[in-house]
């Protein structure tokens, strides 16, 4: 089935854009006027998800990339990783739940929570150009509040 | 305060065409999915389409291909150009607001603005 | 495309009474239901969101429930503010966004 789907970027609360790091890794690092363009542009999709009363299942694709944010085990510890899928199948309306995140939207301000590993988030570290990861703990050192920005083609 | 006023309504003959434009006060369109919703006379509500950015829009199915959504954020402005204009099309049209990304219902609405198809 | 089917069209009801009005997806729609009141030459106001969530400002007579294709929307002890039309709405199930037809909610 098809599915709603939009094109944007994404910067954390301490306003750290997100760029690649090499090609299965994203960082967080302050960008200034044309190195703005760096970003990654994300393809947020609407999909299935557990019923709740106000999270918002998405998943998190790079835009004209057969790539996907996705949550795993590796070490025995949940870990964000980027996925290579088949462009023809992705997105769908009912993603693997690797691939899924719950979107919760308080004061404009967004949190991703894996729905493979709940309260388990997409973070990003104080210090500069770190790798973006999933984290395990809110309102600590790590950051996990983001705000989206539209894309305009 | 947060609102929103739609304009460029009126009469319009079988054939023609119109552009609505709804404006937001309060808060910027940058980060907001906007969406149409119409009502015709004494009828219910019906929903038309839906923007996200500028290259992400969705429509009812009866709604492709005669009318578009845009925006300009720059004028914090949606607008809905509805093209080849029938009877069936007299209606009011309301903008509206989804309550946050994807969640598909609209918490701000404006007046609306009344559309008539007539010859 | 998903069909949303209110019941009753209409209802007839007095100060005081409980009230329910049904919707039915045409498929499951897991708990992505809305229901809005409609005031003559006003716009829509939302009441509830995923099936049973109060909207901000709405009063705790009104309440909803449900979840796959079967919703209800209940008004505990209904007020004369409320005689209005009432619609649901599928927000989730697809691209398209449906409305339900209205059901008329007038006095006895």
């Known amino acids: 089935a098809p599915v709603r789907s939009l094109n944007c970027t994404l910067r954390d609360s301490q306003q750290k854009s997100l760029v690649m790091s090499g090609p299965y890794e994203l960082k967080a690092l302050h960008l200034q006027g044309q190195d703005m363009e760096q970003q990654v542009v994300f393809s947020m999709s609407f999909v299935q998800g557990e019923e709740s009363n106000d999270k918002i299942p998405v998943a998190l694709g790079l835009k004209e990339k057969n790539l996907y944010l996705s949550c795993v085990l590796k070490d025995d510890k949940p870990t964000l990783q980027l996925e290579s899928v088949d462009p023809k199948n992705y997105p769908k309306k009912k993603m693997e739940k690797r691939f899924v995140f719950n979107k919760i939207e308080i004061n404009n301000k967004l949190e991703f929570e894996s729905a493979q590993f709940p309260n388990w988030y997409i973070s990003t570290s104080q210090a500069e150009n770190m790798p973006v990861f999933l984290g395990g703990t809110k309102g600590g050192q790590d950051i996990t509040d983001f705000t989206m920005q539209f894309v305009s083609s | 305060e947060v609102q929103l006023v739609e304009s460029g309504g009126g009469l319009v003959q079988p054939g023609g065409s119109l552009r609505l434009s709804c404006t937001a006060s309060?808060?910027?369109?940058?980060?907001?999915?906007m969406a149409w919703v119409r009502q015709a006379p004494g009828k219910g509500l019906e929903w038309v389409g839906i923007?996200?950015?500028?290259?992400?829009?969705y429509y009812a199915s009866w709604a492709k291909g005669r009318f578009t959504i845009s925006r300009d954020t720059s004028k914090n402005t949606v607008y809905l150009q509805m093209n080849s204009l029938r009877a069936e099309d007299t209606a009011v049209y309301y903008c509206?607001?989804?309550?946050?990304?994807?969640?598909?219902?609209?918490?701000?609405w404006g007046q609306g603005t009344l559309v008539t198809v007539s010859s | 495309e998903i069909v949303m089917t209110q019941s009753p069209s209409t209802l007839s009801a007095s100060v005081g009474d409980r009230v329910i009005i049904t919707c039915q997806a045409s498929?499951?729609?897991?708990?992505?239901l809305s229901w809005y009141q409609q005031k003559p030459g006003k716009a829509p106001k939302l009441l509830i969101y995923?099936?049973?969530t109060l909207a901000s400002g709405v009063p705790s007579r009104f309440s909803g429930s449900g979840s796959g294709a079967e919703f209800t929307l209940t008004i505990s002890s209904l007020q004369p503010d409320d005689f209005a039309t009432y619609y649901c709405?599928?927000?989730?199930?697809?691209?398209?966004?449906?409305f339900g037809q209205g059901t008329k909610l007038t006095v006895l």
């Open positions: 509206a607001r989804e309550r946050q990304i994807f969640s598909g219902d609209f918490v701000l």
């Open positions: 309060g808060f910027s369109l940058s980060d907001a999915a």
């Open positions: 923007i996200y950015d500028s290259a992400s829009t």
């Open positions: 498929q499951s729609i897991d708990n992505w």
């Open positions: 995923r099936a049973s």
């Open positions: 709405q599928n927000t989730g199930g697809g691209i398209n966004i449906a």
